[in-house]
């Protein structure tokens, strides 16, 4: 299709060299409230559209996203050539950042109602560039997090170290939806609640004598518990003794529950006492069996074939740790009578 | 930090509700209210605890149960209710926060109560 | 229910010296044990969680340990502002039941 009608936004995307972020694109195509965009050269004022443009069908999963090849060929379909690039509905997600994203990315409808909605696309022409001003050290993370219940703020990242006076006017959006209440290089959030949860993306324009273009970050917020002043509780087993027939194959699970920590290191192994000696155990990799915001719990299984008298005078020791310290269970085998 | 209101000089067979209030935090699913109580020169006497607001997950001494109702009525503000009064109930009624209670299989897991509030005295005389 | 018993219920001890306080539950309540200091006209302020984990801030003069149905509490180089009342709280139990109780008190009276 013909993409010279469609409208055109430039946008940088400065990344960090130094840590893992995203970007996005939005598909804006004009909503009818704003804008008959995608009538404008079809139709003089007085002429009346049949129907809507494609917007007002508030069907924002129906578009499809083209990539224009710099040498001239055809437009290429995103999903089919680029699996770095995610859609979601009408959002495009760029999973990691380079220079390589650079480049024009189409977007349009997928159902064209009308020979007038062959010209509803927009057309971005995306810039990708490392970061290279040492001057800003302590720049905003592109993953931030926040406290549950406290106060708190997100901060744009290509901005945040600018003074809010220095600060141009910011467009927020978060889960690809228009905050349109904000306009600083910060959010401030009084209180806390996990609904804060989400991708924002920050916006502001940056010209020069020739053009100007709209400067974009992409913030990953989690809200999160503080960490925990806790060692991990062993959940399972709760008692030191265990009843079991000897020769028959017997199976014990460690079930540890640990708080939420940032720098998450859980340890829980297996090792077995006999008089003087002691020794880790190989055992199964250990599985996560629940997580929630506040905590996780992890079990690890020790697998004996069989059970033999030697192993009834041995303790098999549950051992757990995080950054706060240590617990153990021990377990002694008794054989089953009768 | 919390901050108990509520306290008053009331009659035998009265009733009255005792409020919490916090500031700084609010009562999210990670914690759990409590309320303990402290007759005039005797030990601490823990009386129940709720942690996320629906009356079912309340929980309580025994001999507070029936007579004693927690409820959490904001995500800052959480009662304790008291009917049927008697002299035995004149104490400083504390609120405070355990930083971390959970369930497993049957079995509840506290931690300790690391916030306080300063207490709200409660008479009961005729 | 689960019933915390303290000894004793009172203790005299010198500044520098060191004082143990014992408590005691009817019933094994593993390592879920909490430690309070009380000073007159305030409220308590928890020191120990888990019968050995020191709150951030509590000086590491203060120890707990025991686990089951004994637990202690040491407080060595002792100083007048230790000079209060400490209560353990059992911190485990049956859903539903009355656990979360508090032993009786110990007076830390400071010379």
């Known amino acids: 299709f013909n993409i010279s009608g469609c409208s055109t936004k430039k946008l940088l995307w400065t990344y960090s060299t130094r840590s893992e972020e995203e970007f996005v694109l939005f598909c804006d195509l004009p909503e009818p409230q704003k804008s008959h965009f995608c009538h404008r050269n079809r139709l003089s004022p007085k002429q009346v559209p049949e129907h809507l443009p494609f917007m007002g069908s508030n069907d924002l999963s129906d578009v499809q996203w083209y990539q224009q090849p710099s040498n001239g060929d055809p437009l290429e379909d995103i999903r089919k050539s680029y699996p770095h690039i995610i859609q979601d509905k009408c959002t495009l997600h760029f999973l990691t950042p380079g220079v390589n994203n650079s480049g024009s990315y189409i977007c349009r409808p997928k159902m064209i109602k009308s020979p007038y909605d062959v010209a509803c696309c927009v057309k971005m022409i995306l810039e990708v560039k490392p970061q290279t001003n040492a001057s800003c050290e302590y720049s905003a993370s592109h993953k931030q997090d926040l406290l549950l219940g406290s106060t708190g703020s997100i901060s744009c990242p290509s901005l945040s170290c600018q003074s809010d006076a220095q600060s141009p006017a910011v467009t927020w959006y978060k889960n690809g939806k228009l905050l349109s209440v904000e306009r600083s290089n910060r959010i401030v959030v009084d209180e806390v609640y996990d609904y804060h949860q989400g991708t924002y993306v920050c916006d502001y324009t940056q010209s020069d004598t020739v053009s100007s273009w709209t400067v974009r970050a992409v913030v990953q917020v989690r809200t999160i518990v503080g960490d925990t002043k806790l060692k991990p509780d062993i959940l399972d087993p709760v008692e030191d003794t265990l009843e079991v027939e000897l020769g028959k194959p017997l199976t014990i699970s460690c079930k540890a529950r640990f708080g939420f920590e940032r720098v998450f290191n859980p340890v829980i192994k297996w090792y077995i006492k006999d008089s003087d000696l002691e020794w880790e155990v190989s055992v199964p990799e250990a599985k996560s069996i629940k997580s929630t915001l506040k905590d996780e719990i992890i079990e690890r299984n020790i697998i004996l074939e069989k059970v033999t008298q030697r192993d009834l005078r041995r303790k098999f020791v549950c051992f757990v740790q995080n950054s706060i310290g240590n617990t153990t269970q021990s377990v002694q085998l008794k054989e089953k009578r009768g | 930090s919390l901050e108990e209101s509520g306290g008053d000089l009331v009659k035998p067979g009265a009733s009255l509700t005792l409020t919490c209030t916090a500031s700084?935090?609010?009562?999210?699913?990670?914690?759990?209210m409590c309320w303990v109580r402290q007759a005039p020169g005797k030990g601490l006497e823990w009386i129940g605890c709720?942690?996320?607001?629906?009356?079912?997950?309340a929980y309580y001494a025994t001999w507070a149960k029936g007579r004693f109702t927690i409820s959490k009525t904001s995500s800052t503000t959480v009662t304790l209710q008291m009917t049927s009064l008697t002299a035995a109930d004149t104490a400083t009624y504390f609120c405070?926060?355990?930083?971390?209670?959970?369930?497993?299989?049957?079995?509840?897991?506290?931690?300790?109560?690391?916030?306080w509030g300063p207490g709200t005295l409660v008479t009961v005389s005729t | 229910d689960v019933v915390m018993t303290q000894t004793p219920a009172s203790v005299e001890a010198d500044v520098g010296g060191t004082v143990t306080i014992k408590c005691q539950a009817s019933?094994?309540?593993?390592?879920?044990l909490a430690w309070y200091q009380q000073k007159p006209g305030q409220p308590p302020k928890v020191l120990i969680y888990?019968?050995?984990t020191l709150e951030s801030g509590v000086p590491s003069r203060f120890k707990g340990s025991g686990s089951g149905t004994q637990f202690t509490l040491t407080i060595s180089d002792l100083e007048c502002a230790d000079a209060a009342t400490y209560y353990c709280?059992?911190?485990?139990?049956?859903?539903?039941?009355?656990?979360?109780?508090f032993g009786g008190g110990t007076e830390v009276v400071v010379k």
């Open positions: 709280q059992c911190t485990y139990g049956s859903s539903g039941s009355s656990f979360l109780a």
């Open positions: 888990r019968a050995s």
């Open positions: 019933q094994s309540i593993r390592s879920y």
């Open positions: 405070a926060r355990d930083y971390d209670t959970y369930d497993y299989d049957g079995y509840t897991y506290a931690a300790g109560f690391d916030l």
């Open positions: 709720i942690y996320d607001g629906s009356s079912d997950s």
């Open positions: 700084g935090f609010s009562f999210s699913s990670s914690y759990c």
